[in-house]
């Protein structure tokens, strides 16, 4: 903290300008009026203050707004935002997307900092849901943003927002997250025709149930192996050899290279070897001829 000292004669700041970088910390404390600072925050970012000096300015704002800064100040914080703690940010009420963008811009091109994570959390909570414009903005700055949310948080994403999601935004999502996102995507894209629908839904298929995969197998979609490998194992297991062949189309040959990996490995174990042989890929490990297949999960459900 800077000691309270009187401002030297002639040094009282009439406006926030470049001359202030030549002020010592105690002079900034004594000579810069907090209300003036608040109304001219947009100028601070254009002045190369040291963070030591910015600490003094932050302290002045903290004293002026002990309950948290108003949005008119927040929007123009610029590099001073990088001096804010998550505790500071939790006091804010940020409702404007422009404010959010302005602060994300300061942190652009880098990992999400604790400050940014807190800011986004405050913003989304204030809005009540992740609307399309917000999601558009957040995924533009942080492609992995969606996958950083818990399944509970994802449940607040309206289906209309799914249109903003790009395939790369889902790269780090786990099955639990895709379980939540897939039904929303299905709803969002339901009015599209076959091939267009598949292009859009493809990234979300890690959350698709068996019946939807069966339906897709009837539509000549030619799913690539990378997508197939991300499908839920429990959704793939009930598919027949014929259904997988239709689902993958020409990509079915890729099964051989993946036969030791899930879900292909587990799926092979559930198929009759005779059926696997019809693919002509040399897949081994299926159920030998003459063996009876008991579906124990069905038996448990009945008992």
């Amino acid at each position: 903290e800077v000691e309270k000292t009187a401002c030297p004669s002639g040094k009282k700041a009439r406006e926030i300008d470049e001359s202030l970088i030549f002020y010592k910390k105690w002079e900034l404390e004594a000579c810069v009026d907090a209300a003036l600072l608040a109304t001219q925050m947009d100028r601070v970012n254009a002045i190369p203050f040291t963070y030591e000096q910015l600490d003094v300015l932050k302290h002045k704002l903290d004293e002026l707004y002990p309950q948290g800064y108003p949005e008119s100040v927040i929007q123009h914080l610029g590099y001073l935002f990088l001096k804010m703690s998550p505790e500071d940010i939790r006091k804010w009420n940020v409702t404007s997307l422009e404010t959010l963008k302005a602060l994300l811009e300061v942190n652009k091109g880098h990992e999400m900092s604790p400050q940014v994570a807190t800011l986004i959390d405050r913003f989304v909570k204030g809005r009540g849901q992740l609307d399309k414009d917000t999601l558009d903005t957040l995924t533009a700055f942080y492609p992995g943003y969606l996958c950083s949310l818990s399944p509970e948080e994802l449940s607040s994403v309206p289906p209309s927002s799914i249109w903003a999601v790009r395939p790369q935004d889902l790269d780090t999502c786990d099955p639990r997250q895709l379980d939540v996102l897939y039904p929303k995507a299905r709803l969002a894209f339901q009015n599209m025709n076959g091939s267009e629908y598949f292009v859009k839904i493809q990234s979300f298929l890690g959350g698709a149930p068996t019946e939807d995969l069966k339906a897709l197998s009837q539509q000549n979609v030619s799913m690539d192996l990378a997508t197939f490998m991300k499908l839920r194992t429990d959704a793939v297991l009930p598919l027949t050899v014929a259904e997988v062949q239709k689902l993958l189309g020409p990509h079915v040959e890729g099964l051989k290279a993946e036969e030791r990996h899930r879900p292909v490995r587990d799926w092979i174990l559930r198929q009759r070897q005779d059926d696997l042989d019809t693919l002509g890929l040399g897949l081994q490990g299926g159920i030998p001829n003459g063996y009876l297949v008991l579906d124990l999960s069905m038996q448990e459900a009945l008992s």
Partner: nanobody, 119 residues
Framework: VQLVESGGGLVQPGGSLRLSCAAS????????VAWYRQAPGEQREPVAA???????IYADSVKGRFTISRDNAKNTVYLQMNSLKPEDTAVYYC???????????????WGQGTSVTVS
């Protein structure tokens, strides 16, 4: 993060020197840059500064004689000093207003200083 200055030395009045400051390190970005100086028995004071947008600011005592510049590709800041005077004698420090992504906060980065003697 390290800022390393070079280019200081002994020069006659009216002479010129060019100071360089090379930034190295990972997980940080630089916003504003500046040169400060500290004469014997004095406090460190800003001489020239440059904002992230490229605007420059100079202390009255060096206006028209000193020029600050920045090469982003080389991560280097320069201070061209012409028409040097004995009162320019000081240790010159490179400064960067940066952001450390490991720490998660804005930080002040300083070089170790390079000595300039005009006599």
């Amino acid at each position: 993060v390290q800022l390393v200055e070079s280019g200081g030395g002994l020069v006659q009045p009216g002479g010129s020197l060019r100071l360089s400051c090379a930034a190295s390190g990972s997980m940080f970005s630089i916003n504003a840059v500046a040169w400060y100086r500290q004469a014997p028995g004095e406090q460190r004071e800003p001489v020239a500064a440059m904002t992230s947008g490229g605007s420059t600011i100079y202390a009255d005592s060096v206006k028209g004689r000193f020029t600050i510049s920045r090469d982003n590709a080389k991560n280097t800041v320069y201070l061209q000093m012409n028409s040097l005077k004995p009162e320019d004698t000081a240790v010159y420090y490179c400064y960067a207003q940066g952001y450390d992504y490991d720490e998660g906060y804005g930080m002040d980065y300083w070089g170790q200083g390079t000595s300039v003697t005009v006599s």
